[in-house]
């Protein structure tokens, strides 16, 4: 087989992806309130509801239309601490529900791991990959018929998610960055981007960018625990701001934006 | 209702050239991969090459790859299969399917067929 | 490349009577999300292909009840609880694992 463009690494999809069992409950982040006063806003707010409501992660994603606009960078990060996994060799996890910042703003992607031997320090490593659909045309119009279906899907499969699991070979696949030690190298396409790896493995952006949406897998590789779920992903999202933001976004404050 | 139509098929000669068009209507084109499937007369179905909503990715059958070029314009609702250096195996109904969770194709045009013959 | 090979490649079957097509591949379909990339596809005489089950086991928007898809790993099959006439055709099982490959095809005909 042939592929072209960036779409490289693994061709059999998401990999590890959630590191949740399928049968698992879904864990929800919280809803939204709407505020509004004008349809605008209530637009908005529907589409925020689309992305977090309910099992499916459907709803907002990078788009040509967004690139117009103001953004704010929503983070949703589908592994949270209150999925609790069994003990295995090795364990990562996201943990934050979703995280808010304006474009070219600061934003982390939480990533802790945990091994059962640690004579070696592991490898960490933190992927993008761009979405198998595009979330904001769906998040924009939640009635649709392509809606219905992503419903009735997560319905029957709870935790599967159409935007995140596809073969990379339809997909853009990059290294963002990996840590060994204190030595964090950046992937290729990120060099010069002030990015790193802080902490246990988070990922920090001190300036987020239009084409970072999309779903950063972390995943720790040791020598010593072979076994366990060491991958879990994050999905970022940018998304053009409106009028409705404070609304869209309960107890958000928008600050300035910087060129 | 959801729906793809293909054209541009039809008869040619070994070593030239032909593009087929999807026309998709009904749902938010620019939100899922697509894909090209053909069937030769009297045989099974060989998936072709399939794009990425936003054109970026690309992925061909090695029977096709080099010789075959899948694209999409968003603006227009339509996919593209450009088919050079055509040989009579090529021959059979093209359809062109959208790209569905879990990687199926859930919705199919009625086909177009390319007669490779000189 | 994933191979997939079904059986039988002709399926007589009897209005009312169960019928069930397999489809076996050369490596395991199971992804480590815990999903079989395994699809059916009908196709009618004369007519495109129509999704039938995805993901192993989920019936598509529309289908029949009667369809039903199981299986894990290599094996999978798909059955048809009580086969009426309008299910005659082609049945096409296809992995969606690496790339996308088709098995041959089973002919379904009323005896």
């Known amino acids: 087989m042939q592929q072209d463009g960036l779409g490289v690494g693994t061709r059999n999809g998401s990999g590890k992806g959630r590191s949740v069992h399928p049968s698992w409950p879904w864990c929800a982040p919280r809803p939204l309130r709407y505020f509004g006063r004008d349809a605008r806003a209530r637009r908005a707010q529907t589409a925020a509801m689309a992305l977090l409501a309910g099992g499916l992660s459907r709803g907002l994603g990078s788009h040509p239309a967004a690139a117009g606009r103001d953004a704010v960078v929503f983070v949703w990060l589908l592994l949270s601490t209150w999925c609790t996994a069994p003990a295995r060799a090795i364990q990562v996890t996201v943990s934050n529900p979703y995280h808010v910042v304006i474009l070219f703003q600061p934003v982390t992607l939480p990533c802790t791991y945990q091994m059962t031997s640690t004579p070696t320090q592991p490898i960490v490593i933190w992927k993008y990959k761009s979405f198998c659909r595009d979330r904001i045309a769906d998040a924009f119009s939640p009635a649709s018929v392509d809606n219905q279906l992503n419903a009735q899907l997560a319905a029957g499969n709870p935790g599967y998610n159409p935007y995140v699991e596809c073969q990379d070979s339809v997909r853009t696949v990059r290294v963002v960055a990996t840590k060994q030690g204190n030595a964090v190298t950046l992937g290729d396409y990120y060099q010069g981007r002030r990015i790193t790896i802080t902490g246990n493995a988070d990922l920090t952006f001190d300036q987020t960018a239009w084409g970072d949406s999309g779903v950063y897998y972390c995943s720790v590789v040791s020598a010593q625990d072979l076994q366990g779920n060491n991958e879990a992903y994050a999905e970022l999202i940018v998304l053009g701001r409106t009028s409705g933001v404070a609304e869209l976004l309960p107890g958000f404050q928008a600050g300035p934006i910087e060129d | 209702q959801v729906q793809l139509v293909e054209s541009g098929g039809g008869v040619v000669q070994p070593g030239r050239s032909l593009r087929l068009s999807c026309a998709a209507s009904g749902f938010t084109f620019s939100s899922y991969a697509m894909h090209w499937v053909r069937q030769a007369p009297g045989k099974g179905l060989e998936w072709v090459a399939v794009i990425s909503y936003d054109g970026s990715n690309k992925y061909y059958a090695d029977s096709v790859k080099g010789r075959f070029t899948i694209s999409r314009d968003n603006s227009k609702n339509t996919l593209y299969l450009q088919m050079n250096s055509l040989r009579a195996e090529d021959t059979a109904v093209y359809y062109c399917?959208?790209?569905?969770?879990?990687?199926?194709?859930?919705?199919w045009g009625q086909g177009t067929m390319v007669t490779v013959s000189s | 490349d994933v191979v997939m090979t079904q059986s039988p490649l002709s399926l007589p079957v009897t209005p009312g009577e169960p019928a069930s097509v397999s489809c076996k591949s050369s490596q395991s379909l199971l992804r480590s999300n815990g999903y079989n990339y395994l699809d059916w596809y009908l196709q009618k005489p004369g007519q495109s292909p129509q999704l039938l089950i995805y993901l192993g086991s989920n019936r598509a928007s529309g289908v029949p009840d009667r369809f039903s898809g199981s299986g894990s790993g290599t094996d999978f099959t798909l059955k048809i609880s009580r086969v009426e006439a309008e299910d005659v055709g082609v049945y096409y099982c296809m992995q969606a694992l690496e790339s996308w490959t088709f098995g041959q095809g089973t002919k379904v005909d009323i005896k």
């Open positions: 399917a959208r790209d569905s969770p879990g990687n199926a194709f859930d919705i």
